[in-house]
């Protein structure tokens, strides 16, 4: 039996990571021991799972790593990897400083809102995650058809504003569609704006007919596809 030890301490020499906002940060604590140790991460001394972080985090236990994409000022802090087994434990601290960029148009997380397929009568949630230096505002738009056309004479799509909201820069904005029908199918756009400009991302909602209960035991309410 052997207490945990660092297998590549030379890869851990860079203690302070000062990165511009919007960049990706990767912390690694490669270790070994017998029995094989587990790794946990703390932020400023508290257990860290990234649930309150826009974009979340990626924990790759086989690589002993923590990855955070599109870092923002609220990600600043001390990140501790805690490696332990039945014999003992070791820890290492990384310091993260996020250098604020110039104020920019809102950045929308890639892949959101996501293309979604749902069954008639089910409920759907479309998500939009926004990163913005300035306080952003959001609109949800549905692309509509007028007189058989999706576009006006000016070349711009016809849209209907479904929801307008001011949000905090780290919030996830959700559009709830209850009891969807075939008419709800189509293209939806999340528009985020701030004092610099607007940014858009779109997704398609496909609505399938109600499934026959005689041949399906339990259909999921909504299936999400990228």
């Amino acid at each position: 039996q052997q207490a945990p030890y660092w297998t590549h301490p030379q890869r851990m020499e860079k203690k302070l990571h000062a990165v511009p906002a919007g960049n990706t940060v990767k912390f690694r604590c490669p270790a070994a021991g017998n029995p094989t140790p587990t790794i946990r991460w703390l932020k400023d001394g508290q257990a860290f799972h990234g649930e309150n972080r826009i974009g979340g985090i990626r924990l790759r236990h086989q690589h002993w790593s923590l990855v955070m994409e599109s870092v923002v000022p609220s990600d600043r802090g001390t990140y501790t990897c805690l490696v332990e087994n039945a014999v003992g434990s070791i820890r290492y601290n990384y310091l993260l400083d996020v250098l604020e960029r110039s104020p920019h148009r809102p950045i929308l997380q890639a892949g959101l809102p996501a293309n979604t397929t749902a069954v008639v009568g089910s409920d759907v949630e479309l998500l939009c995650k926004v990163y913005s230096d300035a306080q952003p505002h959001i609109q949800w738009l549905k692309h509509i058809v007028i007189n058989g056309s999706s576009f006006g004479a000016d070349g711009f799509p016809y849209v209907q504003v479904l929801k307008t909201a001011d949000i905090n820069s780290s919030e996830v904005e959700v559009l709830y569609l209850r009891n969807v029908s075939a008419e709800d199918a189509g293209e939806y756009t999340c528009l985020a704006g701030n004092s610099i400009g607007l940014s858009y991302q779109s997704a398609w909602l496909t609505v399938l007919p109600e499934e026959d209960p005689t041949w399906t035991a339990a259909a999921p309410e909504a299936r999400y596809t990228d």
Epitope: S102, V161, N194, S195, S199
Partner: antibody, heavy 124, light 112 residues
């Protein structure tokens, strides 16, 4: 007709102050961010400052930070630029420019409407 | 800050001939939403700048179709397919991604 009309320019000595105004008409002023851009005589364009639609966010060029203050009065459809500690290099035509709106627009999201400009001369 | 570099400084064109102005940005202007936020303006003598092209290649309303914008990420071009006498002025590119918004130094277009 969408219009922006600047006023308040003039000749002022270095170190003194001046307040520029921009009167907006023909659009919902309170729904748009607004910018100031300046142009020194015979030179190019330089962005000066922006203010969000509700006045909660303001950003400035480094060259004017701490000396200029952008503000707005949505009840009067007016944008202002308070210029303190003026320097000779602040001599320029100052343009008021409409920025991004609060929502979907069928066209560019700002920097489409410019005022005629007001001349500020800083000279001893 | 994003630096916008414009070439040439000046351009003398025969009416009816094409003209091309280049603009290079120090960083990519391709935003996360897939749009490229470069704008083109013309400033005629004694007037404020007038918008010609927005979001890389979209002509602003009322702009003649002899004006076109193209490019990608950091390299952009404004083309006038057939220059007319009224096209005389100084042309500017601008990045509209982040503050401070920055402009190219300008290209003066004259008629031969």
């Amino acid at each position: 007709e969408v219009q922006l009309l600047e006023s308040g320019g003039g000749v002022v000595q270095p170190g003194r102050s001046l307040r520029l105004s921009c009167a907006a008409s023909g659009f919902t002023f309170s729904s748009y961010a607004m910018h100031w851009v300046r142009q020194a005589p015979g030179k190019g364009l330089e962005w000066v400052a922006v203010i969000s639609y509700d006045g909660s966010n303001k950003y400035y060029a480094d060259s004017v930070k701490g000396r200029f203050t952008i503000s707005r009065d949505n009840s009067k459809n007016t944008l202002s630029l308070q210029m303190n500690s003026l320097r000779v290099e602040d001599t320029a035509i100052y343009y008021c420019v409409r920025g991004a709106g609060r929502g979907y627009t069928r066209g560019p999201d700002g920097f489409d409407i410019w005022g005629q400009g007001t001349m500020v001369t800083v000279s001893s | 800050d994003i630096v916008m570099t414009q070439t040439p400084l000046s351009l003398s064109v025969t009416p009816g001939q094409p003209a091309s102005i280049s603009c290079t940005s120090s960083r990519s202007l391709l935003h996360s939403d897939g749009k490229t936020y470069v704008y083109w303006y013309v400033q005629k003598s004694g007037q404020p700048p007038q918008l010609l092209i927005y979001e890389l290649s979209n002509r602003f309303s009322g702009v003649p179709d002899r004006f076109s914008g193209s490019g990608s990420r950091t390299d952009f071009t404004l083309k006038i397919s057939r220059v007319e006498a009224e096209d005389v002025g100084v042309y500017y590119c601008m990045q509209y991604v982040e503050a401070p918004l920055t402009f190219g130094g300008g290209t003066k277009v004259e008629i031969k």
